[in-house]
């Protein structure tokens, strides 16, 4: 039995997979910040995780997916204050009892040091200094990502 969050996540990812062959993105759109081969959009408003996921989808993007600790640190360096939290594309899958990225892959336990519980209705946020498990209903900011070409495969991280 999938939770509503898992269903929403899977639906959005399936719709994204159908469009992976659209023309590549050469430059970041206005208001988006380039970080290596990605464009990031840091929201100024707040939403629960589900709404944040949907907002990124409407922007033809996804909630942020983080490959490794190095990418995490570079992303955190763009956060201007320690009291700002941002949703990323990682939440707890109750059916698989594991942290799961919205592209379907599971978290490599070495990648992120998560502070907080791994349990139902938990989603992952990042701050300037840490990675937190928060209740998915919490209204905080979020980060969307678009990939720059030549990356044309599915969004990472790979499992």
């Amino acid at each position: 039995q999938k939770s509503s969050i898992e269903k929403c996540s899977v639906d959005i990812q399936q719709s994204r997979n159908k469009t992976t062959e659209r023309p590549g993105l050469l430059n970041c759109p206005i208001y988006w910040q380039q970080l290596r081969e990605k464009c990031l959009l840091f929201s100024h408003t707040v939403n629960p995780w589900n709404n944040s996921l949907a907002d990124c989808s409407t922007k033809e993007s996804s909630l942020l997916l983080i490959r490794d600790k190095d990418e995490l640190i570079h992303t955190q360096n763009l956060i201007r204050d320690k009291a700002i939290l941002f949703w990323i594309g990682l939440n707890f899958s109750l059916s698989e009892k594991n942290w799961k990225w919205i592209n379907g892959s599971f978290l490599n336990s070495n990648d992120l040091e998560i502070r907080g519980d791994a349990k139902e209705n938990s989603c992952i946020s990042i701050s300037q200094t840490s990675v937190y498990s928060e209740y998915c209903s919490t209204e905080i900011r979020w980060i969307c990502q678009k990939e720059l070409t030549p990356v044309r495969n599915k969004v990472y991280p790979d499992s």
Partner: antibody, heavy 119, light 107 residues
């Protein structure tokens, strides 16, 4: 109806300790950051500390850092402020308020509890 | 830390008057500015958030404007129950800071 009710204030000697509590009801407590704000007699408002919904993340004003500890028990819908090494300048009405992540406003406040630090 | 400066520190006006309180930040805070009302012996109450958004249940005679460093709270027609101290607050960065307050009295 959202309600925040503080308790635990009182008279304490300089160097002493006190623990304030804030009982919350009428909303999903664990989904909200919470803060403590204080007001010295006849003075303005001063933000003291904030804690994230899960309790994993905490922030403090420089004036209380290392002396005060904010915490929460989501199973009891209660916010706490442990105050150690109290000083005369900590004398104030202490309010708990809903909010604390940037850019939250404090949309609900408790009625306040008076802490007096005096010998 | 971001300093918030309100003016005037107090004012006296008649019922029905238009009242304006200003708040200046020591650096740009975009629109991350809130206004609170505190009546004597009571807890503060949120009036305006994000510089110009009226909090639910607050009378429409209250309005806010501004962005960057200069902000204004306006009471379009002062009522007896508006006797209070008004505070601005920035939520752009920690530590969260308040203005020193503006005390509004009724003539």
């Amino acid at each position: 109806e959202v309600q925040l009710v503080e308790s635990g204030g009182g008279l304490v000697q300089p160097g002493g300790s006190l623990r304030l509590s804030c009982a919350a009801s009428g909303f999903t407590f664990s989904s909200y950051a919470m803060s403590w704000v204080r007001q010295a007699p006849g003075k303005g408002l001063e933000w003291v500390s904030a804690i994230s919904g899960s309790g994993g993340s905490t922030y403090y004003a420089d004036s209380v850092k290392g002396r005060f500890t904010i915490s929460r028990d989501n199973s009891k819908n209660t916010l706490y402020l442990q105050m150690n090494s109290l000083r005369a300048e900590d004398t104030a009405v202490y309010y708990c308020a809903r909010g604390g992540y940037l850019p939250d406003a404090f949309d609900y406040w408790g009625q306040g509890t008076l802490v007096t630090v005096s010998s | 830390d971001i300093q918030m400066t309100q003016s005037p520190s107090s004012l006296s006006a008649s019922v029905g008057d238009r009242v304006t309180i200003t708040c200046r930040a020591s650096q740009s805070i975009s629109s991350y500015l809130n206004w609170y009302q505190q009546k004597p012996g009571k807890a503060p109450k949120l009036l305006i958030y994000a510089a110009s958004s009226l909090q639910s249940g607050v009378p429409s005679r209250f309005s806010g404007s501004g962005s960057g460093t200069d902000f204004t709270l306006t009471i379009s027609s002062l009522q007896p129950e508006d006797l209070a101290t008004y505070y601005c607050q920035q939520t752009y960065s920690t530590p969260l800071t308040f203005g020193q307050g503006t005390k509004v009295e009724i003539k």
